[in-house]
C-alpha cells in the first residue's frame, strides 16, 4: 500500500558538511515498527545511505558507523547527515515503510536535493 | 497456481556457508506478498529466520542477523537465503513462504530444504 | 521477543471429538495471531489468519477465536485427516514468533 511522504526540496550543507532536513509521512495506520531508509540519487544511479528501525516514540538506532543520525516526533523523524563534501551533493531521497504490525505501507519522497561546497582552505599565515 | 520451488538438499561442514533458493510462479512477486523463511530442526518447532520486502527491505531475526542474509532476484523470482558460520544446531529443514502485506502470515510454503551440518 | 505458549503440549482424540487448542502470549498482540497444521515432512498448512479468519480452501469445522493475550483453535468435529501438529504464530512484532506446538495423536 502507498504512503505519501513530504521532504523539503532543497537544502544547503553547513561549512562542517552536516545536512539537515524534515521527512514527514502520513501514516494511514498505527505503526509500532517504522523503517526510514535514505537514498542517494546521483547519475540516476540508487544507492543507499543509511538506514534505521525505530518503534514509536523511541529513538531512531542507525549502526554505528552511519553518516546518519535522527530524532522522530509522531510523523516526524528529522535526519542528519554528516561528513559530506562537494562530490556527495546530490538526491536525497527518502524511503518510509510502515512494518508492524501489518498491513505493510511503502512510502517515497521525492528527494531533497542536497548541495555541499567544500570550505576554502584557510590561507597560510606568516 | 501459486508455487514455492526450492533448492534441493545440502551436506555442509562446521563453519561453511549454504545458500537456499526459492523460484515463486503463479503470481507477480513485485506487489502484494513478501518472501519469508522459517527453519525447523528435527523433531522441533518452527523458528522465523527473516523476511524480504518487495521494496527490497530486509528483516531478521535477532538471532540468526549476524549470520544470515537474504536477498531477492526479481527477474527471476527467485529468493535466496543463505547462512554462514554454520554449526550442528544449524542442521534443520529450511523453507521459504509467501506471505500477503495485508497481514503477516504465511498462506504458500515451498516444499522445504534440509541443510545438515556434519563434520 | 513475544513468547507463544500453547497448550497442551500433546493430546489424544478420537474421530468425531470437539477439540480446542490454546496459545497464549506474553504480551498483547491484538488479533495477529495465525494458525497452521503440519503433517510429519510435509510443510505447514496455513489454517487461520488475523486470530479468526480461515484461510482459503480450509474446512469450516476449523474456527479461531480471541485477542490480545489468549487465542483458541477450535476443531468442531474431528476428521481423520485432522491428526497432526498444529502451530500459532504471531505477526504484531518482529521477530515473528511461533508456539511450540501441539501433536493431535489418534485415541
Known amino acids: 500500500k502507498a504512503m505519501h511522504v513530504a521532504q523539503p526540496a532543497v537544502v544547503l550543507a553547513s561549512s562542517r558538511g552536516i545536512a539537515s532536513f524534515v521527512c514527514e509521512y502520513a501514516s494511514p495506520g498505527k505503526a509500532t515498527e517504522v523503517r526510514v531508509t535514505v537514498l542517494r540519487q546521483a547519475d540516476s544511479q540508487v544507492t543507499e545511505v543509511c538506514a534505521a528501525t525505530y518503534m514509536m516514540g523511541n529513538e531512531l538506532t542507525f549502526l554505528d558507523d552511519s553518516i546518519c543520525t535522527g530524532t522522530s516526533s509522531g510523523n516526524q523523524v528529522n535526519l542528519t547527515i554528516q561528513g559530506l563534501r562537494a562530490m556527495d551533493t546530490g538526491l536525497y531521497i527518502c524511503k518510509v515503510e510502515l512494518m508492524y504490525p501489518p498491513p505493510y505501507y511503502l512510502g517515497i519522497g521525492n528527494g531533497t536535493q542536497i548541495y555541499v561546497i567544500d570550505p576554502e582552505p584557510c590561507p597560510d599565515s606568516d | 497456481q501459486v508455487q514455492l520451488v526450492q533448492s534441493g538438499a545440502e551436506v555442509k561442514k562446521p563453519g561453511s556457508s549454504v545458500k537456499v533458493s526459492c523460484k515463486a510462479s503463479?503470481?507477480?512477486?513485485?506487489?502484494?506478498?513478501?518472501w519469508g523463511w522459517i527453519r525447523q530442526a528435527p523433531g522441533q518447532g518452527l523458528e522465523w529466520i527473516g523476511a524480504?520486502?518487495?521494496?527490497?527491505?530486509?528483516y531478521y531475526s535477532p538471532s540468526l542477523k549476524s549470520r544470515v542474509t537474504i536477498t531477492a532476484d526479481k527477474s527471476t523470482s527467485t529468493a535466496y537465503m543463505e547462512l554462514s558460520s554454520l554449526r550442528s544446531e544449524d542442521t534443520a529443514v529450511y523453507y521459504c513462504a509467501r506471505g500477503p502485506l495485508s497481514y503477516y502470515a504465511f498462506d504458500y510454503w515451498g516444499q522445504g530444504t534440509l541443510v545438515t551440518v556434519s563434520s | 521477543d513475544i513468547q507463544l505458549t500453547q497448550s497442551p503440549s500433546s493430546l489424544s482424540a478420537s474421530v468425531g471429538d470437539r477439540v480446542t487448542i490454546t496459545c497464549r502470549a506474553s504480551?498483547?498482540?491484538?488479533?495477529?495471531l495465525a494458525w497452521y497444521q503440519q503433517k510429519p515432512g510435509k510443510a505447514p498448512k496455513l489454517l487461520i489468519y488475523?486470530?479468526?479468519n480461515r484461510a482459503t480452501g480450509i474446512p469450516s469445522r476449523f474456527s479461531g477465536s480471541g485477542s490480545g493475550t489468549d487465542f483458541t483453535l477450535t476443531i468442531s468435529s474431528l476428521q481423520p485427516e485432522d491428526f497432526a501438529t498444529y502451530y500459532c504464530?504471531?505477526?504484531?512484532?518482529?521477530?515473528?514468533?511461533f508456539g511450540q506446538g501441539t501433536k493431535v495423536e489418534i485415541k
Open positions: 503463479g503470481y507477480s512477486i513485485t506487489s502484494g506478498y513478501h
Open positions: 504464530q504471531q505477526y504484531y512484532r518482529s521477530p515473528i514468533t
Open positions: 488475523d486470530a479468526s
Open positions: 504480551q498483547s498482540v491484538s488479533r495477529y
Open positions: 524480504i520486502y518487495h521494496s527490497g527491505s530486509t
